[in-house]
Protein backbone atom coordinates (compact mmCIF):
# COMPACT_ATOMS: atom_id res chain seq x y z
CA UNK A 1 0.00 0.00 0.00
CA UNK A 2 1.24 3.53 -0.67
CA UNK A 3 2.53 5.75 2.11
CA UNK A 4 -0.28 8.00 3.42
CA UNK A 5 -0.09 11.73 2.59
CA UNK A 6 1.99 13.62 5.12
CA UNK A 7 4.32 10.63 5.37
CA UNK A 8 5.31 10.77 1.72
CA UNK A 9 8.31 8.57 0.93
CA UNK A 10 9.70 11.48 -1.14
CA UNK A 11 9.88 13.69 1.93
CA UNK A 12 13.08 14.21 3.85
CA UNK A 13 12.44 13.65 7.57
CA UNK A 14 12.11 17.00 9.35
CA UNK A 15 12.31 17.24 13.14
CA UNK A 16 9.66 19.99 13.40
CA UNK A 17 7.48 19.58 10.34
CA UNK A 18 5.06 22.42 9.66
CA UNK A 19 1.37 21.43 9.41
CA UNK A 20 0.32 21.06 5.78
CA UNK A 21 -1.56 23.93 4.15
CA UNK A 22 -4.81 23.25 2.30
CA UNK A 23 -3.09 23.42 -1.12
CA UNK A 24 -0.27 21.16 0.01
CA UNK A 25 -2.68 18.60 1.45
CA UNK A 26 -4.65 18.52 -1.80
CA UNK A 27 -1.48 18.23 -3.90
CA UNK A 28 -0.14 15.39 -1.74
CA UNK A 29 -3.51 13.65 -1.74
CA UNK A 30 -3.66 13.66 -5.54
CA UNK A 31 -0.06 12.44 -5.82
CA UNK A 32 -0.86 9.67 -3.34
CA UNK A 33 -3.87 8.56 -5.41
CA UNK A 34 -1.78 8.72 -8.60
CA UNK A 35 0.83 6.47 -6.99
CA UNK A 36 -1.96 4.01 -6.11
CA UNK A 37 -3.29 4.10 -9.67
CA UNK A 38 0.21 3.36 -10.99
CA UNK A 39 0.38 0.22 -8.82
CA UNK A 40 -3.08 -0.90 -9.99
CA UNK A 41 -2.17 -0.27 -13.63
CA UNK A 42 0.94 -2.44 -13.19
CA UNK A 43 -1.19 -5.38 -12.06
CA UNK A 44 -3.70 -4.82 -14.87
CA UNK A 45 -0.98 -4.59 -17.52
CA UNK A 46 0.88 -7.64 -16.20
CA UNK A 47 -2.29 -9.72 -16.06
CA UNK A 48 -3.61 -8.97 -19.55
CA UNK A 49 -2.58 -7.27 -22.78
CA UNK A 50 -5.17 -4.51 -22.33
CA UNK A 51 -2.54 -1.78 -22.05
CA UNK A 52 -1.40 -2.48 -25.63
CA UNK A 53 -4.88 -3.21 -27.01
CA UNK A 54 -6.17 -1.23 -29.98
CA UNK A 55 -9.79 -2.21 -29.24
CA UNK A 56 -10.26 0.41 -26.50
CA UNK A 57 -12.95 2.25 -28.48
CA UNK A 58 -15.24 -0.82 -28.31
CA UNK A 59 -15.34 -0.72 -24.53
CA UNK A 60 -15.21 3.07 -24.24
CA UNK A 61 -18.68 3.28 -25.81
CA UNK A 62 -20.16 1.64 -22.67
CA UNK A 63 -18.51 4.17 -20.36
CA UNK A 64 -19.14 7.83 -19.68
CA UNK A 65 -15.92 8.62 -17.88
CA UNK A 66 -15.33 12.25 -16.86
CA UNK A 67 -12.84 14.14 -19.04
CA UNK A 68 -11.36 17.62 -18.93
CA UNK A 69 -12.19 19.87 -21.87
CA UNK A 70 -11.31 23.50 -22.58
CA UNK A 71 -14.83 24.63 -21.65
CA UNK A 72 -14.31 23.36 -18.08
CA UNK A 73 -11.99 26.27 -17.33
CA UNK A 74 -9.13 24.09 -16.09
CA UNK A 75 -6.70 24.62 -18.98
CA UNK A 76 -4.35 27.59 -18.85
CA UNK A 77 -6.12 29.21 -21.77
CA UNK A 78 -9.51 30.31 -20.48
CA UNK A 79 -8.71 29.32 -16.89
CA UNK A 80 -11.61 29.97 -14.50
CA UNK A 81 -11.00 28.99 -10.89
CA UNK A 82 -14.63 28.53 -9.79
CA UNK A 83 -15.79 26.71 -12.96
CA UNK A 84 -12.74 24.48 -12.83
CA UNK A 85 -13.15 23.60 -9.15
CA UNK A 86 -16.79 22.65 -9.77
CA UNK A 87 -15.66 20.46 -12.71
CA UNK A 88 -13.00 18.71 -10.60
CA UNK A 89 -15.37 17.96 -7.72
CA UNK A 90 -18.21 16.89 -10.05
CA UNK A 91 -15.81 14.68 -12.01
CA UNK A 92 -14.47 13.02 -8.86
CA UNK A 93 -18.02 12.35 -7.64
CA UNK A 94 -18.81 10.77 -11.04
CA UNK A 95 -15.69 8.60 -10.79
CA UNK A 96 -16.80 7.14 -7.45
CA UNK A 97 -19.09 4.52 -9.03
CA UNK A 98 -16.22 3.39 -11.28
CA UNK A 99 -13.88 3.16 -8.28
CA UNK A 100 -16.49 1.01 -6.57
CA UNK A 101 -16.46 -1.26 -9.65
CA UNK A 102 -12.68 -1.63 -9.29
CA UNK A 103 -12.96 -3.02 -5.75
CA UNK A 104 -13.33 -6.68 -6.78
CA UNK A 105 -11.08 -6.47 -9.83
CA UNK A 106 -7.70 -6.97 -8.17
CA UNK A 107 -6.04 -9.94 -6.52
CA UNK A 108 -2.63 -8.86 -5.23
CA UNK A 109 -3.55 -5.15 -5.08
CA UNK A 110 -6.90 -5.38 -3.29
CA UNK A 111 -5.72 -3.07 -0.47
CA UNK A 112 -4.39 -0.60 -3.01
CA UNK A 113 -7.76 -0.44 -4.78
CA UNK A 114 -9.46 0.29 -1.46
CA UNK A 115 -6.83 2.96 -0.64
CA UNK A 116 -7.48 4.71 -3.98
CA UNK A 117 -11.22 4.68 -3.33
CA UNK A 118 -10.98 5.99 0.24
CA UNK A 119 -8.34 8.59 -0.63
CA UNK A 120 -10.58 9.92 -3.38
CA UNK A 121 -13.38 10.41 -0.84
CA UNK A 122 -10.98 12.37 1.36
CA UNK A 123 -9.84 14.44 -1.64
CA UNK A 124 -13.46 15.33 -2.45
CA UNK A 125 -13.91 16.54 1.14
CA UNK A 126 -10.76 18.70 0.91
CA UNK A 127 -11.96 20.23 -2.35
CA UNK A 128 -15.50 20.84 -1.11
CA UNK A 129 -14.04 22.92 1.73
CA UNK A 130 -12.19 24.97 -0.89
CA UNK A 131 -15.24 25.52 -3.13
CA UNK A 132 -17.36 28.64 -2.65
CA UNK A 133 -20.22 27.57 -4.91
CA UNK A 134 -21.25 24.12 -3.66
CA UNK A 135 -24.74 24.55 -5.17
CA UNK A 136 -23.27 24.22 -8.67
CA UNK A 137 -21.97 20.72 -7.89
CA UNK A 138 -24.32 18.00 -9.05
CA UNK A 139 -24.16 14.72 -7.16
CA UNK A 140 -24.73 11.58 -9.27
CA UNK A 141 -28.06 9.81 -8.76
CA UNK A 142 -27.57 6.70 -6.53
CA UNK A 143 -30.15 4.65 -8.49
CA UNK A 144 -28.43 5.41 -11.81
CA UNK A 145 -25.08 4.51 -10.26
CA UNK A 146 -26.43 1.20 -8.92
CA UNK A 147 -27.77 0.15 -12.31
CA UNK A 148 -24.52 1.21 -14.02
CA UNK A 149 -22.55 -0.90 -11.53
CA UNK A 150 -24.77 -3.93 -12.21
CA UNK A 151 -24.35 -3.43 -15.96
CA UNK A 152 -20.55 -3.19 -15.72
CA UNK A 153 -20.33 -6.29 -13.52
CA UNK A 154 -22.45 -8.27 -15.99
CA UNK A 155 -19.98 -7.74 -18.87
CA UNK A 156 -17.92 -10.63 -20.22
CA UNK A 157 -14.36 -11.13 -18.90
CA UNK A 158 -12.64 -9.33 -21.79
CA UNK A 159 -14.87 -6.27 -21.45
CA UNK A 160 -14.38 -6.24 -17.68
CA UNK A 161 -10.60 -6.25 -18.11
CA UNK A 162 -10.84 -3.49 -20.71
CA UNK A 163 -13.20 -1.46 -18.49
CA UNK A 164 -10.73 -1.74 -15.58
CA UNK A 165 -7.90 -0.53 -17.80
CA UNK A 166 -9.96 2.39 -19.16
CA UNK A 167 -11.15 3.52 -15.73
CA UNK A 168 -7.58 3.60 -14.40
CA UNK A 169 -6.28 5.40 -17.46
CA UNK A 170 -9.08 7.99 -17.48
CA UNK A 171 -8.88 8.57 -13.74
CA UNK A 172 -5.12 9.12 -14.03
CA UNK A 173 -5.65 11.66 -16.84
CA UNK A 174 -8.37 13.45 -14.90
CA UNK A 175 -6.23 13.69 -11.76
CA UNK A 176 -3.19 14.92 -13.67
CA UNK A 177 -5.22 17.69 -15.29
CA UNK A 178 -6.74 18.52 -11.89
CA UNK A 179 -3.29 18.68 -10.29
CA UNK A 180 -2.08 21.22 -12.85
CA UNK A 181 -5.22 23.30 -12.57
CA UNK A 182 -5.18 23.35 -8.77
CA UNK A 183 -1.61 24.65 -8.86
CA UNK A 184 -2.94 27.74 -10.62
CA UNK A 185 -5.45 28.44 -7.83
Amino acid sequence: APVPPGEDSKDVAAPHRQPLTSSERIDKQIRYILDGISALRKETCNKSNMCESSKEALAENNLNLPKMAEKDGCFQSGFNEETCLVKIITGLLEFEVYLEYLQNRFESSEEQARAVQMSTKVLIQFLQKKAKNLDAITTPDPTTNASLLTKLQAQNQWLQDMTTHLILRSFKEFLQSSLRALRQM
Epitope: K10, D11, V12, T21, S23, E24, D27, K28, I30, R31, L34, M68, F75, Q76, S77, R169, K172, E173, L175, Q176, S177, L179, R180, R183, Q184
Partner: antibody, heavy 120, light 106 residues
Framework: QVTLRESGPALVRPTQTLTLTCTFS??????????VGWIRQPPGEALEWLAH???????YYNPALKGRLAVSKDTSKNQVVLSMNTVGPGDTATYYC????????????WGQGILVTVSS | DIQMTQSPSSLSASVGDRVTITCRAS??????LAWYQQKPGKAPKLLIY???YLADGVPSRFSGSGSGTDYTFTISSLQPEDIATYYC????????FGQGTKVEIK
Protein backbone atom coordinates in the same frame (compact mmCIF):
# COMPACT_ATOMS: atom_id res chain seq x y z
CA GLN B 1 15.12 4.69 -26.28
CA VAL B 2 13.90 8.30 -25.98
CA THR B 3 15.41 10.91 -28.30
CA LEU B 4 14.45 14.49 -29.21
CA ARG B 5 15.88 16.61 -32.02
CA GLU B 6 15.33 20.31 -32.72
CA SER B 7 15.30 21.64 -36.29
CA GLY B 8 14.77 25.02 -37.88
CA PRO B 9 16.69 28.00 -39.29
CA ALA B 10 20.10 28.92 -37.91
CA LEU B 11 19.60 32.56 -38.93
CA VAL B 12 16.45 34.67 -38.70
CA ARG B 13 15.97 38.32 -39.64
CA PRO B 14 14.62 40.76 -37.03
CA THR B 15 10.79 41.16 -37.03
CA GLN B 16 10.36 37.74 -38.69
CA THR B 17 8.67 34.70 -37.15
CA LEU B 18 10.90 31.90 -35.90
CA THR B 19 9.48 28.40 -36.32
CA LEU B 20 11.22 25.45 -34.66
CA THR B 21 10.27 21.77 -34.81
CA CYS B 22 10.99 19.14 -32.19
CA THR B 23 10.92 15.62 -33.61
CA PHE B 24 10.95 12.88 -31.00
CA SER B 25 10.94 9.10 -30.74
CA UNK B 26 10.68 6.51 -27.99
CA UNK B 27 7.46 7.92 -26.54
CA UNK B 28 4.08 9.18 -27.73
CA UNK B 29 2.48 12.53 -27.02
CA UNK B 30 -0.88 10.79 -26.95
CA UNK B 31 0.13 8.97 -23.73
CA UNK B 32 -1.54 10.50 -20.69
CA UNK B 33 0.74 12.72 -18.64
CA UNK B 34 3.28 13.20 -21.44
CA UNK B 35 4.50 16.71 -22.22
CA VAL B 36 7.02 18.37 -24.51
CA GLY B 37 8.47 21.73 -23.51
CA TRP B 38 10.71 24.39 -25.05
CA ILE B 39 13.58 26.07 -23.24
CA ARG B 40 16.16 28.55 -24.54
CA GLN B 41 19.55 29.77 -23.43
CA PRO B 42 21.14 32.96 -24.73
CA PRO B 43 24.96 32.69 -25.10
CA GLY B 44 26.58 32.71 -21.65
CA GLU B 45 23.25 33.14 -19.87
CA ALA B 46 20.81 31.04 -17.84
CA LEU B 47 18.10 28.69 -19.05
CA GLU B 48 14.71 30.25 -19.79
CA TRP B 49 11.53 28.16 -19.96
CA LEU B 50 9.33 29.16 -22.91
CA ALA B 51 6.32 26.87 -23.22
CA HIS B 52 5.07 23.33 -23.01
CA UNK B 53 2.21 21.32 -24.43
CA UNK B 54 0.49 18.38 -22.77
CA UNK B 55 -0.91 15.21 -24.29
CA UNK B 56 -4.46 16.61 -24.05
CA UNK B 57 -3.49 19.86 -25.85
CA UNK B 58 -3.33 21.94 -22.67
CA UNK B 59 -0.67 24.63 -23.32
CA TYR B 60 1.41 26.67 -20.91
CA TYR B 61 3.45 29.75 -21.89
CA ASN B 62 6.04 31.92 -20.20
CA PRO B 63 3.95 34.96 -19.13
CA ALA B 64 6.73 37.35 -20.20
CA LEU B 65 6.56 36.04 -23.79
CA LYS B 66 3.00 34.75 -23.99
CA GLY B 67 1.80 37.09 -26.76
CA ARG B 68 4.70 36.08 -29.04
CA LEU B 69 4.62 32.30 -28.60
CA ALA B 70 2.48 29.51 -30.02
CA VAL B 71 3.04 25.80 -29.48
CA SER B 72 1.30 22.98 -31.32
CA LYS B 73 1.67 19.24 -31.75
CA ASP B 74 1.28 16.67 -34.49
CA THR B 75 0.91 13.39 -32.62
CA SER B 76 0.98 11.26 -35.78
CA LYS B 77 4.34 12.73 -36.84
CA ASN B 78 5.78 12.78 -33.29
CA GLN B 79 6.45 16.49 -33.61
CA VAL B 80 5.95 19.65 -31.57
CA VAL B 81 6.26 23.06 -33.22
CA LEU B 82 7.16 26.34 -31.52
CA SER B 83 6.49 29.67 -33.23
CA MET B 84 7.82 32.98 -31.97
CA ASN B 85 6.80 36.14 -33.76
CA THR B 86 8.56 39.53 -34.15
CA VAL B 87 11.97 38.24 -33.14
CA GLY B 88 14.79 40.59 -32.16
CA PRO B 89 18.52 40.23 -31.36
CA GLY B 90 17.57 39.37 -27.75
CA ASP B 91 16.04 36.13 -29.05
CA THR B 92 19.44 34.84 -30.17
CA ALA B 93 19.89 31.64 -28.17
CA THR B 94 20.24 27.88 -28.19
CA TYR B 95 16.72 26.46 -28.23
CA TYR B 96 16.06 23.08 -26.58
CA CYS B 97 13.05 20.84 -26.55
CA UNK B 98 12.60 18.43 -23.65
CA UNK B 99 10.18 15.79 -22.44
CA UNK B 100 8.31 15.70 -19.16
CA UNK B 101 6.56 12.53 -18.09
CA UNK B 102 3.78 12.09 -15.60
CA UNK B 103 3.06 14.15 -12.50
CA UNK B 104 6.63 14.34 -11.15
CA UNK B 105 7.10 16.89 -13.91
CA UNK B 106 10.82 17.11 -14.46
CA UNK B 107 12.45 17.33 -17.87
CA UNK B 108 14.05 13.91 -18.06
CA UNK B 109 15.13 13.86 -21.73
CA TRP B 110 16.46 16.80 -23.76
CA GLY B 111 17.37 17.45 -27.38
CA GLN B 112 20.91 18.56 -28.18
CA GLY B 113 19.72 22.11 -28.91
CA ILE B 114 19.78 24.37 -31.96
CA LEU B 115 21.56 27.73 -32.06
CA VAL B 116 19.39 30.42 -33.62
CA THR B 117 20.91 33.82 -34.41
CA VAL B 118 18.69 36.85 -35.01
CA SER B 119 20.54 39.31 -37.20
CA SER B 120 20.03 41.41 -40.30
CA ASP C 1 4.23 34.35 -10.86
CA ILE C 2 6.63 32.44 -8.65
CA GLN C 3 10.26 33.56 -8.82
CA MET C 4 13.24 31.34 -8.06
CA THR C 5 16.34 32.77 -6.36
CA GLN C 6 19.37 30.51 -6.62
CA SER C 7 22.60 31.06 -4.70
CA PRO C 8 25.51 31.33 -4.93
CA SER C 9 25.92 32.33 -8.57
CA SER C 10 29.34 30.65 -8.59
CA LEU C 11 31.58 28.73 -6.22
CA SER C 12 35.03 27.23 -6.16
CA ALA C 13 35.78 24.10 -4.15
CA SER C 14 38.39 21.37 -3.88
CA VAL C 15 37.98 17.76 -4.99
CA GLY C 16 36.34 15.85 -2.13
CA ASP C 17 34.63 18.93 -0.68
CA ARG C 18 30.96 19.05 0.21
CA VAL C 19 29.16 21.53 -2.05
CA THR C 20 25.77 23.09 -1.27
CA ILE C 21 23.53 25.17 -3.52
CA THR C 22 20.25 26.71 -2.41
CA CYS C 23 17.11 27.69 -4.24
CA ARG C 24 14.38 29.86 -2.70
CA ALA C 25 10.92 30.21 -4.20
CA SER C 26 8.87 33.39 -3.73
CA UNK C 27 6.03 31.20 -2.43
CA UNK C 28 5.41 27.59 -1.38
CA UNK C 29 6.05 25.17 -4.26
CA UNK C 30 5.27 22.01 -2.25
CA UNK C 31 8.46 20.08 -3.19
CA UNK C 32 7.73 20.39 -6.93
CA LEU C 33 11.35 21.14 -7.75
CA ALA C 34 14.00 19.68 -10.04
CA TRP C 35 17.78 20.15 -10.23
CA TYR C 36 19.77 19.95 -13.48
CA GLN C 37 23.45 19.81 -14.39
CA GLN C 38 24.70 21.51 -17.56
CA LYS C 39 28.21 21.11 -18.90
CA PRO C 40 29.59 23.62 -21.47
CA GLY C 41 28.14 23.12 -24.95
CA LYS C 42 25.78 20.36 -23.75
CA ALA C 43 22.08 20.09 -22.97
CA PRO C 44 21.06 20.08 -19.31
CA LYS C 45 20.77 16.72 -17.55
CA LEU C 46 18.17 15.92 -14.89
CA LEU C 47 19.70 15.01 -11.51
CA ILE C 48 16.91 15.40 -8.92
CA TYR C 49 13.12 15.57 -9.25
CA UNK C 50 10.34 16.15 -6.71
CA UNK C 51 12.97 17.90 -4.52
CA UNK C 52 14.55 14.69 -3.16
CA TYR C 53 14.30 11.92 -5.78
CA LEU C 54 17.49 10.92 -7.61
CA ALA C 55 16.97 10.50 -11.37
CA ASP C 56 17.97 7.21 -13.01
CA GLY C 57 21.71 6.64 -13.31
CA VAL C 58 22.68 9.65 -11.19
CA PRO C 59 25.51 9.00 -8.65
CA SER C 60 24.46 8.94 -5.00
CA ARG C 61 26.85 11.76 -4.09
CA PHE C 62 24.14 14.09 -5.45
CA SER C 63 21.16 14.75 -3.20
CA GLY C 64 18.29 17.18 -2.73
CA SER C 65 16.33 18.30 0.30
CA GLY C 66 13.89 20.96 1.40
CA SER C 67 10.21 21.82 1.50
CA GLY C 68 7.95 24.86 1.32
CA THR C 69 10.00 27.70 -0.17
CA ASP C 70 13.58 26.59 0.64
CA TYR C 71 15.47 23.83 -1.17
CA THR C 72 19.06 22.59 -1.10
CA PHE C 73 21.17 20.65 -3.59
CA THR C 74 24.26 18.90 -2.26
CA ILE C 75 27.29 17.19 -3.77
CA SER C 76 28.69 15.19 -0.84
CA SER C 77 32.17 14.79 -2.33
CA LEU C 78 33.03 16.95 -5.33
CA GLN C 79 34.59 15.11 -8.29
CA PRO C 80 36.43 16.64 -11.28
CA GLU C 81 33.57 15.55 -13.60
CA ASP C 82 31.10 17.62 -11.53
CA ILE C 83 32.44 20.87 -13.00
CA ALA C 84 29.28 22.36 -14.52
CA THR C 85 26.49 24.86 -14.00
CA TYR C 86 23.57 23.68 -11.85
CA TYR C 87 20.01 24.93 -12.17
CA CYS C 88 16.87 24.51 -10.09
CA UNK C 89 13.41 24.60 -11.65
CA UNK C 90 9.99 24.55 -10.04
CA UNK C 91 6.80 22.99 -11.37
CA UNK C 92 4.07 24.89 -9.61
CA UNK C 93 2.19 26.67 -12.41
CA UNK C 94 4.53 28.12 -15.04
CA UNK C 95 8.04 26.80 -14.35
CA UNK C 96 11.01 29.18 -14.38
CA PHE C 97 14.61 28.15 -13.75
CA GLY C 98 16.93 29.58 -11.13
CA GLN C 99 19.76 31.79 -12.36
CA GLY C 100 22.28 28.94 -12.17
CA THR C 101 25.35 28.17 -10.05
CA LYS C 102 28.70 27.68 -11.75
CA VAL C 103 30.82 25.12 -9.87
CA GLU C 104 34.59 25.22 -10.40
CA ILE C 105 37.54 23.37 -8.87
CA LYS C 106 40.12 25.26 -6.84
Amino acid sequence: QVTLRESGPALVRPTQTLTLTCTFSGFSLSTSGMTVGWIRQPPGEALEWLAHIWWNDDKYYNPALKGRLAVSKDTSKNQVVLSMNTVGPGDTATYYCARMEDYDEAMDYWGQGILVTVSS
Amino acid sequence: DIQMTQSPSSLSASVGDRVTITCRASENIYSNLAWYQQKPGKAPKLLIYAATYLADGVPSRFSGSGSGTDYTFTISSLQPEDIATYYCQHFWGTPPFGQGTKVEIK
